[in-house]
């Protein structure tokens, strides 16, 4: 059975300023390939946080993602501000030349309230 | 820059234990999984044991598993091997590794030397 | 296991290529190099074909299904070693090595 993408929540609501946590679960490691975190769609969505590689201010993996069998992939987004607001999508890639986008989760949408 | 340093390699008698650190430098150690990769004389490499960042999850080889374990302490910046019923077998040169993401290595470390001897 | 011919030779300024099967498609690869026995291995390609940035760009990695293959192009006098492609399964949890290919620059 292919592999599932879970988003839990299709919405949080955060204050600007806190840290809101976007879940995301998969039902499988295979078929092997990296995770990535996207805010928005199609051609101009923005690379949040790649489990890949390290350096992404402000957003940090939840679980220890360094487990050989670990399955979750929830982030953390620390001091976020207005323009965080959008919807996130945890996205599962199949390895390659280059790697193939194979399932995406159903995503979770941002608000951020003022202070 | 990322540094590894292996420490403990030792002429141990067979039977007996030994424990293996690795002191690392120029990264967030915590934040990585770590290995031993071992190498006996004239062979190829083999992989010994691996921790994830937080020490949580240990994995080991079929051939040191249940007389092994591997630790670390991150407030140290140490990786530990504790080898115990040691066979000549377990000579070999003893690695530290950092792992990528997908559990591959990125660096090593100098190595340190043990040697069974009776 | 990983299998990988145990000896390759080549010219200096030749092309040569390094194959390793065996891992299955659950599997990741990379491949490290040792100048000599006992000494520290170094990485020239992780993740099938990520180079770290300190390793020179004619070495480059390529995986299509179970087989990886390092390829080194130009090869240099420097470039005499023993080659090991290593695997990580995702199925087992457990990495592997293959025995190590003997670069021999003629």
């Known amino acids: 059975t292919e592999v599932k993408v879970i988003q839990p929540e299709k919405s949080v609501s955060v204050a600007a300023g806190d840290s809101t946590v976007l879940n995301c679960t998969l039902t499988s490691l295979l078929p092997v390939g990296p995770i990535r975190w996207y805010r928005g769609v199609g051609q101009s969505r923005q690379l949040i946080y790649s489990f890949t590689t390290e350096h992404f201010p402000r957003v940090t993996n939840v679980s220890d993602a360094t487990k050989r069998s670990n399955l979750d992939f929830s982030i953390r987004i620390s001091n976020v501000t207005p323009e965080d607001a959008g919807t996130y999508y945890c996205v599962k890639f199949q390895r390659g030349s280059p790697d193939t986008e194979i399932q995406s989760g159903g995503g979770t949408e941002v608000y951020v309230l003022a202070k | 820059d990322v540094q590894l340093v292996e420490s403990g390699g030792a002429v141990v008698r067979p039977g007996e234990t030994l424990r293996l650190s690795c002191t690392a430098s120029g990264f967030t150690f915590s934040s990585y999984a770590m290995s031993w990769v071992r190498q006996a004389p004239g062979k190829g490499l083999e992989w010994v044991s691996g921790?994830?960042?937080?020490?949580?999850?240990?994995y080991y080889a079929d051939s040191v598993k249940g007389r092994s374990t591997i630790s670390r302490d991150n407030s140290k910046n140490t990786l530990y091997l504790r080898m115990s019923s040691l066979t000549a077998e377990d000579t070999a040169v003893y690695y530290c590794?950092?792992?990528?993401?997908?559990?591959?290595?990125?660096?090593w470390g100098l190595g340190t030397l043990v040697t069974l001897s009776s | 296991a990983l299998t990988q011919p145990a000896s390759v030779s080549a010219n200096p300024g030749e092309t040569v290529k390094i194959t390793c099967s065996g891992g299955g498609t659950s599997s990741y690869y990379g491949w490290y190099q040792q100048k000599s026995p006992g000494s520290a291995p170094v990485t020239l390609i992780?993740?099938?074909?990520k180079r770290p940035s300190d390793i020179p760009s004619r070495f480059s990695g390529s995986a299509s299904g179970s087989t990886a293959t390092l390829t080194i192009t130009g090869v240099q006098a420097e470039d005499e070693a023993v080659y090991y492609c290593g695997g990580y399964d995702y199925t087992t949890y457990v990495n592997t090595f293959g025995a190590g290919t003997t670069l021999t620059v003629l």
């Open positions: 590794a950092r792992e990528t993401w997908n559990h591959l290595f990125d660096y």
């Open positions: 921790i994830s960042a937080s020490g949580s999850d240990t």
């Open positions: 992780h993740s099938d074909d």
